[in-house]
């Protein structure tokens, strides 16, 4: 019957396992008159046969490694051998079996690595080949370190990328390798096919000898540079050296300063390029980078520290044009009137900023001069000779000389003589009762007005009232602002109220003056008042520990890898359930109990990085309130995209016949990340047979020129295959085709007679 093994002539594809002796026919084609026989052409390799009656079969075992696809054509012929149907393509796909073992290209590898090399940066590749199909487990290779000799404290210093065979240092290796202690290591590496996952996998081993070399790429000692240097600039201050000659050095200013006064030359010598000012910036931290000829970093940057040493280049400055203090008329000798605090921009706690205070003039000198003294180093003014009388002299002006070791500055102080402070503030109410507020009451809200009065001289420190909460608010959730004209106190919320930690607070206020009370007068119960704050519960949403959570992983991490985690707490203490929102690519899942985030699909940096999703924390039980935070997953690039043409190049043509060899320029790109220097592709012809007619030459890292080698081309389309290699780790290669048509031209354009094929080239060379 027609069906799986027989039927009419039509394009078909058959899959046959290699290595199996023929056990049945492939297909029986049925002839429709006038067809009487069949003919087989194409890649038969004398294996595939069609009998005249249409029976297609193969006569011996196939070998995928010899040919993975046999492209055959079957035609139906009439009695005269003329094709009456077809030819139609018949594709035989040879399915792979694991009949080849992986083999290392070398039985021994040798390499060297510098101490402190970046962990994970490959310094050597081992490479094995397996003739089996790399698209199946049969040809998927898995590299492993079998043993490291010597092994110190059971710590692996080396690691291997099990897919690429790239050998690099582990974090411990980067930190601990020391050629003085151990200059060489030996690794035994195995490679298995079947992705290393099967008991039936084939394997091979190789030996790797590694020499550890000294790393002179080290951060120099911190540098001290005196500010305001008058020496000719630039001045060499330190140096860095890469391990090999030819490195290109640069400095990176992480702080993005408007003025960056340092430079580095191509020897690695670092200079300060202009005088520094410690008062502008007292220390600099920047980085020295060594790059290769292509602008790729050779190693991690070195941190350079420059401390700017102070010189005494700043005079003292007064706190304000006039500093005002008050003194009560009956104050006793030695009482503090106030402290004058001058400033000096030079370095703190050094002689350059150490200040001396001296009174140089008192006006008026009534009833005598020298009524005040100032502590030489502290700047505290004291009453020196006698009590003062407001009715005699209500105001004194002092000129005070403030000096450091080189500079002198005059500051002015006004001392107002005021009434004695013999009245205490008295609250108009001793108990302001109860106040009930919800815990989500806004910060800044005024919740209570309090009032005390003081009978002392108005608008002086004796009558001014300051309110303090002295009990019941250890968290500092409340504050009191005073109106200086009315002495009214406004109780405001400074921090969020919290039912869970303080449902009831018994608050005690104290009212006091900035001026001290006269001897014998004390604050009493009249200067105290209380009130009770009752906070009511509001069910609050869970709170995330961060607004944005961020994690960084390589784009090729295995499915199921933990890529980050989030945490939230519920104010009411309820359990929390985590979920994801906006995972548009279906890459992630979250453990709803722990908040750990895992990958569930292959990640792809080229699809967009960082990948942003929202995490939702929801109360379990209660009113199921939820809150949202961001999770940003930064994907680090791996070289997983082969180069391709940057645009569509159909429509290229040369006018036929060529009068002289011609050329055209094309551009390549790929989707991987190209830090620092952009792509660095290399170009070659895709097959040897093209070399008689064409040549390809590189212009730069992204562009190349395709040139004709002669002028003897037929008037037709040529498809030129070009191999583009990205030089990555591992290197990836793309084979692209440039269709170039040689055609008769009219006024510089391709001429096509009417009714000719479509797809006329439109770009002439």
């Amino acid at each position: 019957q027609e069906g799986k093994f027989s039927g009419p002539l039509k394009p078909m594809t058959f899959s046959i396992y290699e290595g199996q002796e023929p056990s049945q026919i492939i297909f029986q084609f049925k002839a429709n008159p006038p067809a009487v026989t069949f003919e087989l052409t194409g890649e038969t390799d004398n294996i595939f046969v069609i009998e005249r009656e249409g029976l297609l079969y193969y006569n011996r075992a196939l070998d995928r490694e010899t040919r993975s696809t046999h492209n055959l054509q079957v035609a139906a012929l009439d009695a005269n051998g003329i094709i009456v149907e077809g030819p139609v393509p018949i594709t035989i796909k040879v399915k792979d079996i694991n009949d080849n073992r992986p083999t290392f290209l070398q039985s021994k590898y040798e390499g060297s690595v510098r101490q402190n090399s970046r962990p994970g940066k490959p310094f050597l590749y081992v490479n094995a080949t397996d003739l089996d199909d790399p698209a199946t487990p049969n040809g998927q290779l898995y590299y492993q370190i079998v043993i490291q000799l010597p092994m110190i404290n059971n710590v692996m210093y080396f690691q291997i990328n099990n897919k690429t065979g790239a050998i690099s240092l582990t974090r411990e290796g980067s930190q601990e390798l020391n050629p003085a202690k151990n200059p060489s290591y030996n690794l035994v590496i195995s490679v298995k096919d079947m992705g290393g996952q099967s008991e039936n996998s084939f394997s091979d081993t190789t030996s790797v000898d590694i020499i550890v070399t000294e790393n002179i790429w080290k951060a120099p000692k911190p540098v001290e540079m005196v500010e305001n240097s008058t020496d000719p600039h630039p001045i060499k201050i330190t140096q860095v050296r890469w391990n090999d000659p030819g490195a290109q050095y640069s400095l990176v200013d992480k702080e993005k300063l408007p003025r960056f006064p340092f430079s580095i030359d191509q020897e690695g010598d670092i200079y300060v390029t202009q005088p520094l000012d410690r008062e502008e910036k007292d220390a600099y931290v920047f980085y020295a980078v060594a790059k290769d000829e292509y602008g790729k970093p050779l190693s991690y940057p070195l941190e350079i520290h420059v401390k700017v040493k102070d010189i005494n280049d700043n005079p003292p400055t007064c706190p304000s044009p006039v500093t005002v203090f008050e003194v009560q008329e009956n104050e006793r000798l030695g009482n503090s009137i106030g402290t004058l605090t001058a400033h000096d921009r030079d370095e703190e706690n050094t002689a350059n900023s150490f200040l001396n205070y001296r009174i140089v003039e008192q006006t008026p000198k009534l009833p005598m001069d020298g009524l005040f003294l100032i502590q030489t180093y502290a700047g505290m003014l004291q009453l020196a000779k006698q009590s003062l009388k407001k009715q005699d002299t209500p105001q004194y002006n002092l000129t005070i000389e403030v000096s450091d070791k080189d500079f002198k500055t005059l500051c002015f102080v006004q001392i107002n003589v005021i009434d004695i402070n013999d009245q205490i503030p008295i609250f108009e109410k001793s108990d302001y009762g109860n106040l009930t507020l919800a815990e989500d009451t806004n910060i800044g809200s005024t919740i209570l007005t309090i009032q005390a009065t003081d009978a002392d001289e108005p608008f002086t420190g004796s009558s001014k009232i300051l309110y303090h909460i002295i009990k019941g608010d250890s968290e500092g959730r409340l504050g009191v602002d005073t109106d200086p004209h009315t002495n009214t106190g406004y109780v405001i919320i400074k921090k969020p109220l919290d039912f869970e930690t303080a449902a009831v607070s018994n608050i005690v206020f104290k009212a006091e003056n900035p001026e001290p009370l006269v001897f014998g007068v004390k604050y009493n119960a009249s200067s105290f008042a209380k009130f009770t704050l009752i906070v009511t519960d509001v069910n609050e949403a869970p709170q995330f520990s961060q607004h944005v959570f961020q994690a960084k992983v390589s784009e090729d991490v295995a499915i199921g890898t933990k890529v980050g985690n989030v945490t939230a707490k519920d104010p009411e203490g309820l359990d929390i359930s985590y979920s994801l929102r906006g995972d548009t690519r279906g890459w992630l899942k979250i453990d709803h109990v722990t908040g750990e985030i895992f990958s569930v699909a292959p990640l792809d940096r080229e699809a967009g990085s960082p990948y942003r999703v929202q995490v939702v924390a929801t109360e379990v039980g209660g009113s199921s309130l939820s809150s949202v935070s961001e999770f940003h997953l930064i994907l680090m690039d791996v070289n997983d995209n082969p180069p391709r043409l940057a645009k569509d190049y159909t429509g290229l043509f040369f006018c036929h016949p060529l009068s002289a060899p011609g050329s055209l320029i094309f551009e390549a790109t790929d989707d991987d990340q190209h830090l620092f220097r952009g792509p660095h592709f290399t170009f070659s012809l895709g097959s040897g047979s093209l070399q008689n007619d064409w040549e390809v030459s590189k212009i730069n890292g992204t562009h190349a020129r395709l040139s004709t080698r002669h002028t003897e081309f037929e008037e037709r389309e040529y498809v030129v295959l070009i191999r583009i290699n990205d030089g990555g780790r591992p290197p990836l290669e793309g084979i692209v085709s440039l269709p170039v048509t040689f055609c008769s031209c009219v006024e510089g354009s391709c001429f096509r007679p009417a009714g000719h094929q479509t797809g006329i080239p439109t770009v002439g060379m």
Epitope: P33, V36, E39, D78, A79, N80, G81, I82, P87
Partner: antibody, heavy 119, light 112 residues
Framework: QVLLQQSDAELVKPGASVKISCKAS????????IHWVKQRPEQGLEWIGY????????KYNEKFKGKATLTADKSSSTAYMQLNSLTSEDSAVYFC????????????WGQGTSVTVSS | DIVMTQAAPSVPVTPGESVSISCTSS???????????LYWFLQRPGQSPQLLIY???NLASGVPDRFSGSGSGTAFTLRISRVEAEDVGVYYC?????????FGSGTKLEIK
């Protein structure tokens, strides 16, 4: 051995018809196509068409459609060609020919039948 | 229709010498199976045509190996080395690639 025996010469008047035969022997008649070829005096060869007795498949050169009619009688292993509305242009020797089984070449030929159209 | 051209109506030759007869086609007779569908026939005076060469270069059974065929997809040559008297007649090329089959106009071999 393979033999193709054609009928004798014919003298016919303009406007008339003639039917010439080609009797096959020495092989299975239905297995092979029979071709007919025309040769005018002192001129080249022209392919008229073929008949495949197994299927009854017939293919004509467009130039001879309406002029020649090909038939076959499997019982007598004979192929026929009838020529209609004869004119002096149809005066020629007509050959039948058989293809080889695999290489599809006219290896076997009849001796030819001369047709003369004259009033 | 494919046009077969035999440019030389006749070629004179001395017995024992070699001679080449050419034929061209208006379309390539090379098919994707690698075969070139070109045949050579000899028609001796008063006889039916006789097959000499099939598929451009293959000698038909019973034909002396003095005859050989060669060519590309569109230009073909029949070569006779050491011509004998019995080789006289008209030589025709014919294409067998597609319908209608077509013959060349013939080249007459004459003995000097």
């Amino acid at each position: 051995q393979v033999l193709l025996q054609q009928s004798d010469a014919e003298l016919v008047k303009p406007g008339a018809s003639v039917k010439i035969s080609c009797k096959a022997s020495g092989y299975t008649f239905t297995d092979h196509a029979i071709h007919w070829v025309k040769q005018r005096p002192e001129q080249g060869l022209e392919w008229i068409g073929y008949i495949y007795p197994e299927h009854g498949t017939i293919k004509y050169n467009e130039k001879f459609k309406g002029k020649a009619t090909l038939t076959a009688d499997k019982s007598s292993s004979t192929a026929y060609m009838q020529l209609n509305s004869l004119t002096s242009e149809d005066s020629a020797v007509y050959f039948c020919s058989r293809l080889t089984n695999y290489f599809y070449v006219m290896e076997y030929w009849g001796q030819g039948t001369s047709v003369t159209v004259s009033s | 229709d494919i046009v077969m051209t035999q440019a030389a109506p006749s070629v004179p030759v001395t017995p024992g010498e070699s001679v080449s007869i050419s034929c061209t086609s208006s379309k390539s007779l090379l098919r994707s199976n690698g075969n070139t569908y070109l045949y050579w026939f000899l028609q001796r005076p008063g006889q039916s045509p006789q097959l000499l060469i099939y598929r451009m270069s293959n000698l038909a059974s019973g034909v002396p190996d003095r005859f050989s065929g060669s060519g590309s997809g569109t230009a073909f040559t029949l070569r006779i080395s050491r011509v004998e008297a019995e080789d006289v007649g008209v030589y025709y090329c014919m294409q067998h690639l597609e319908y209608p089959f077509t013959f060349g106009s013939g080249t007459k071999l004459e003995i000097k």
